[in-house]
Amino acid sequence: IWELKKDVYVVELDWYPDAPGEMVVLTCDTPEEDGITWTLDQSSEVLGSGKTLTIQVKEFGDAGQYTCHKGGEVLSHSLLLLHKKEDGIWSTDILKDQKEPKNKTFLRCEAKNYSGRFTCWWLTTISTDLTFSVKSSRGSSDPQGVTCGAATLSAERVRGDNKEYEYSVECQEDSACPAAEESLPIEVMVDAVHKLKYENYTSSFFIRDIIKPDPPKNLQLKPLKNSRQVEVSWEYPDTWSTPHSYFSLTFCVQVQGKSKREKKDRVFTDKTSATVICRKNASISVRAQDRYYSSSWSEWASVPCS
Amino acid sequence: RNLPVATPDPGMFPCLHHSQNLLRAVSNMLQKARQTLEFYPCTSEEIDHEDITKDKTSTVEACLPLELTKNESCLNSRETSFITNGSCLASRKTSFMMALCLSSIYEDLKMYQVEFKTMNAKLLMDPKRQIFLDQNMLAVIDELMQALNFNSETVPQKSSLEEPDFYKTKIKLCILLHAFRIRAVTIDRVMSYLNAS
């Protein structure tokens, strides 16, 4: 058993039918010695008396808010949560496996640049009685500071019969140098509590591996005289690291017809312009990627050909 | 995706082309190592990230873009003295900081070159003959060093008398390639920045 926060404790259970569970001793936080009784949750049934209460915690029915009273007055509370270990593996019931970029990916994180700011998000089908708390650091043995905000509900989607909820959090490394070569990964730890179930999820990454630039901005077309060709130009996104000559991007320009089946013409360039043939009803899209370290491509920025 | 090949203009900063070739070569070699050594811990998540140049060179600091020198987190200054007569510098652009930066890059390349050659000698003794260093990568390191043209003491190749542990050697190769790829990215960024200056 360990303390998650004041008066909230996590009991780790080897989870299988007929398991013996864990013996837990609760102590009433009071100078009083006599006339103390214990109850669980809203029930008025007295579970025991005395300054300490010994319970055998086996299942969720044994978890909850234990309260010690004296003469109708509440003295203190202890909330017991359960953390299930199923055949050597901690349970992952609360969050959905996003399966991207690989199986057992519960937390996904992205950074728009090398400033040390990043966003993580996760999915769940649970709508109520759910709380998250996020901590992060650079490295684990001698951790350096990363500050995270509060997790917030950022999107709701309908997936088949189920509603899916997306939560996200923003974090910022306290002293980040955009040019630094990372040797210790960022660690992100999310504590999730649903009703009386506790779970924790972790992700470990280098900022360089989670970079996804914003789409190029100011995408413009300039028709070339007496030609079906157009000059496409764009600019680096505002959120990208500077100077751009050091943090360079490479670009992919795509000409896509109305129909998804039509052949796509693609050009790769390091410049911020390209000459392409603009077909009728087609659109031109441009996306960006770090020129030297192949992390994710940005989303497309698009303009119609007409 | 192969990195785009830059065709250098005659007046172009001479090292940019070489640094792009270096990044392409080390990226290819790392990819090959990860495929060949699939049953070894060779992915970024599995290896320990070690920098063999730590406390010996200070490339990131010495080559910091001017715009980032205002960022306190980037000024983890380490006093290191370097020889300063590089030929990548067009004489007009020669400055002490730039020379310090390029000589630091040269020292990095020299250290990695020695490590890779020592490692290749061990890998050639492996009866499995599973993986060797790409000669193209070694040649590209050499070409960039020549382009930088710094006079420096030659570091003798490390020779080992004991029987090599091939498992450990292959893991060390992965660690070295990951670290060298990161350094090659920094070198490429620096060359691109200097070229634009």
């Epitope: 299988y16 039918p17 398991a19 055949d87 050597g88 593996i89 | -």
Partner: antibody
Framework: QVQLVQSGGGVVQPGRSLRLSCAAS????????MHWVRQAPGKGLEWVAF????????YYADSVKGRFTISRDNSKNTLYLQMKSLRAEDTAVYYC????????WGQGTMVTVSS | SYVLTQPPSVSGTPGQRVTISCSGG????????VKWYQQLPGTAPKLLIY???QRPSGVPDRFSGSKSGTSASLAITGVQAEDEADYYC????????????FGTGTKVTVL
């Protein structure tokens, strides 16, 4: 006392269907994940499928994917394995078992696929 | 499609020490715990070892398990006639848990 009692095995022709049941007692069935495992005559153990405690996630071996469906009825404390498009190579003793570091197995039920 | 490899058979005389190996990879045994089962003819498998080296109550202490890197082993010190059975190791793959992997199985013969 944890008990898993299996039923529904038998002889069936190739291409036909069969449903196996596993009735649980002696524990809170709705709190635990469950597996199906099979063993062809004279062969080793082969994992078949798994279902989470609340039925929200199901996992299958490649050899049965698309043909077999694992399900559970927590109100009846029963686990099921619906087997369709049966093949001769599905002939085996099928076991249900609980998920956890200590597991409990059913007695097994024989499924014979033969024309 | 077995990923956990066991020797098909091992044998020993009563009182001898018999060991069975189970060889896997970094993503299964290297990342997860191992179980061992004993299966007597015509019966369901019985759990002998869980968590690599833990014995459930009721399992004789002559059975012991261990794990090192990507391999695990089961030892029977002082093998007895009633130990003649099939033995299976079991683990998970870190990316596909709870998809379960069983070893190929080992027949233990007491001479």
């Amino acid at each position: 006392q944890v008990q898993l009692v299996q039923s529904g095995g038998g002889v069936v022709q190739p291409g036909r269907s069969l449903r196996l049941s596993c009735a649980a007692s002696g524990f809170t069935f709705s709190s635990y994940g469950m597996h199906w495992v099979r063993q062809a005559p004279g062969k080793g153990l082969e994992w078949v499928a798994f279902i989470r405690y609340d039925g929200s996630n199901k996992y299958y071996a490649d050899s049965v994917k698309g043909r077999f469906t694992i399900s559970r009825d927590n109100s009846k404390n029963t686990l099921y394995l619906q087997m369709k498009s049966l093949r001769a190579e599905d002939t085996a003793v099928y076991y249900c078992k609980t998920h956890g570091s200590h597991d409990n197995w059913g007695q097994g039920t024989m499924v014979t696929v033969s024309s | 499609s077995y990923v956990l490899t066991q020797p098909p058979s091992v044998s020993g005389t009563p009182g001898q020490r018999v060991t069975i190996s189970c060889s896997g990879g970094r993503s299964n045994i290297g990342s997860n715990t191992v179980k061992w089962y004993q299966q007597l003819p015509g019966t369901a498998p019985k759990l002998l070892i869980y968590g690599n080296d833990q014995r459930p109550s009721g399992v004789p202490d002559r059975f012991s398990g261990s794990k090192s890197g990507t391999s695990a082993s089961l030892a029977i010190t002082g093998v007895q006639a009633e130990d003649e059975a099939d033995y299976y190791c079991q683990s998970y793959d870190r990316g596909t848990h709870p998809l379960t992997m069983f070893g190929t199985g080992t027949k233990v013969t007491v001479l």
